[in-house]
């Protein structure tokens, strides 16, 4: 017997659907109507036939009461080929729901997204996460998607993007966006970061994550942030192969005074990089290749320094820096 495609936990909290049959019974998903967090994985199916069964241009207000009764707060949709028109239809209907967090992963969006009709209500998301989503419209995808969202988005995460650079002139500002995560885009690089950080479109960013994004030097990142007018409080550059030295011909970059936390863990560093901010509250240099304790003049003024997992640190060694947070135990790096 084939397993049920959808499973609802005994508390009506989490519902997970895995539709792997070539012609799945989509009605099985109705058991998720009472769940708060819903995950729907479509097994790589092409959802084009859906367009024949639904009227994508129908007034979504007719579904408003039905959709308002959904408890869903967080929705994940994955592994499908989705016509842009169908995605838009779903977003229009979900605008009447309580949905706050939307995750799209392993999707291929085909066709172009129509413009937002004047009477349409945008989706009031606080968090949008995209992983391995390709768009037929290339660089303009963010601007097209953005028009279907209300301007209160707080968290935006874009991983394994096929086009991590955006068409900046078409993108409107994200006035409430405090967290931007571009991690897991290894081809991004510092030049790509400059293209992705559309100037003055991200005025409220506090947390910027750039793990595994092909960054080369903290100074190069500093320059990209300065060019975009982005002043994060927290910057995560972990899991990049960073060079400690700076290109002598590169202009010196002044870090924003707003930056107080910098993560440089798992960055292959053999020495403390040059050109770090002069003052930080938190600096994480764990799991690098530092062969000796950093000298005070190599480090910024820092309250909380983490050096765990570096070769020079043997369990039981005296702490190398006042106020450091080393456990004395080498973590699994």
């Amino acid at each position: 017997t084939t397993p049920e495609p959808c499973e609802l936990d005994d508390e009506d909290f989490r519902c997970v659907c895995n539709f792997s049959e070539p012609q799945p019974d989509w009605s099985e998903a109705f058991q998720c109507v009472s769940a708060v967090e819903v995950e729907i994985h479509a097994g790589g199916l092409n959802l084009e036939p859906f367009l024949k069964r639904v009227d994508a241009d129908a007034d979504p207000r007719q579904y408003a009461d039905t959709v308002k009764a959904l408890r869903v707060r967080r929705l994940t949709v994955g592994a499908a080929q989705v016509p842009a028109q169908l995605l838009v239809g779903a977003l229009r209907v979900l605008a009447y729901s309580r949905l706050k967090e939307l995750t799209l992963e392993d999707l291929k969006i085909t066709g172009t997204m129509p413009p937002l009709p004047l009477e349409a209500t945008g989706l009031a998301l606080s968090s949008l996460r995209l992983r391995n989503v390709s768009w037929a419209t290339g660089r303009s995808w963010l601007a097209e998607l953005q028009q279907w969202l209300k301007p209160g988005l707080k968290v935006l995460s874009i991983a394994q993007a096929h086009s991590p650079a955006f068409s900046c002139e078409q993108v409107r500002a994200f006035p409430a966006l405090t967290s931007l995560d571009l991690s897991d885009n290894p081809g991004l690089g510092e030049r790509g970061l400059m293209a992705a950080l559309c100037p003055h479109k991200f005025p409220a960013i506090q947390n910027l994550a750039l793990r595994n994004t092909g960054m080369e030097t903290p100074t190069g990142v500093c320059a990209a942030l300065a060019a975009a007018g982005v002043q994060p409080h927290s910057l995560d550059l972990s899991h990049n192969s960073l060079r400690a030295t700076v290109n002598p011909s590169a202009p010196r970059c002044m870090w924003s005074s707003a930056l107080n936390s910098l993560n440089l863990s798992f960055a292959g560093l053999e020495q403390v990089p040059k050109g770090l901010p002069a003052k930080l509250r938190v600096l994480d240099l764990s799991c690098n290749r530092l062969n000796r304790a950093p000298q005070p003049d190599e480090l910024p003024e820092v309250d909380n320094l983490t050096l765990d997992g570096n070769p020079f640190l043997v369990p039981g060694t005296a702490l190398p820096h006042e106020g450091s947070m080393n456990s004395g135990v080498v973590p699994a790096c």
């Epitope: 936990d9 508390e11 009506d12 909290f13 989490r14 109507v33 009472s34 708060v36 967090e37 009764a69 959904l70 408890r71 707060r73 967080r74 309580r98 967090e101 968090s127």
Partner: antibody, heavy 115, light 111 residues
């Protein structure tokens, strides 16, 4: 059988940050469910503070949202509450609880806000 | 926010009596076929204990003298034959919509 245990200081000074940790045994906090903090001022009713879900998603009571952070440490199977800028009105028994129908409760810990 | 109003705020009854506590919601707590309204018992110095979930389902280990009914905005907790150990404060709670809210409580005493 899931068990929850709150820990943290019983006395916090006004304007400081209240920090509590809930250690969960018998169940992984990343499996499913919501992991909540609920409080009860002495002699009063119950108030939901917020949750962190199995996925790491959070939801907070709007009345406390500007002061509350709920986070988790999956390696220790723990989740934590931070409530900033506390006043005497935050004096309460704080419970950690599993689910949205609150079937599993810690025994509660009294936190007094006083100078 | 959904407000829950319990009545009465307190009541005194004799052992063996049938006791009814009501809970009224300011808006529906139903989502399709389910009512997300739950009942708890709290004894002094103890954490609350779930009695009834989703309006009418008896939580495992709870005596069968406890029952619940209702839908949308009006709900009832019934104790068919009051026992001395039932002295406690009873709360209703909704989990249909955040913020998840509780009623103000009903204090039950023995005459």
């Amino acid at each position: 059988q899931v068990q929850l245990q709150e820990s943290g200081p019983g006395l916090v000074k006004p304007s400081e940050t209240l920090s509590l940790t809930c250690t969960v045994s018998g169940y992984s906090i990343t499996s499913d469910s919501a992991w909540n903090w609920i409080r009860q001022p002495p002699g009063k009713g119950l108030e939901w503070i917020g949750y962190i879900s199995y996925s790491g998603s959070t939801s907070y009571n709007p009345s406390l949202k500007s002061r509350v952070t709920i986070s988790r440490d999956t390696s220790k199977n723990q989740f934590s509450l931070k409530l900033s800028s506390v006043t005497a009105a935050d004096t309460a028994v704080y419970y950690c609880v599993r689910g949205l129908r609150f079937a599993y409760w810690g025994q509660g810990t009294l936190v007094t806000v006083s100078s | 926010d959904i407000q829950l109003t319990q009545s009465p705020s307190s009541l005194s009854a004799s052992v063996g009596d049938r006791v009814t506590i009501t809970c009224r919601a300011s808006e529906s707590v139903d989502s399709y076929v389910n009512s997300f309204l739950h009942w708890y018992q709290q004894k002094p110095g103890k954490a609350p204990k779930l009695l009834i979930y989703r309006a009418s389902n008896l939580q495992s280990g709870v005596p069968s003298r406890f029952s619940g009914s209702g839908s949308r905005t009006d709900f009832t907790l019934t104790i068919s034959s009051l026992q001395p150990e039932d002295v406690a404060t009873y709360y209703c709670q909704q989990s249909n919509e955040d913020p998840y809210t509780f009623g103000q409580g009903t204090k039950l005493e023995i005459k």
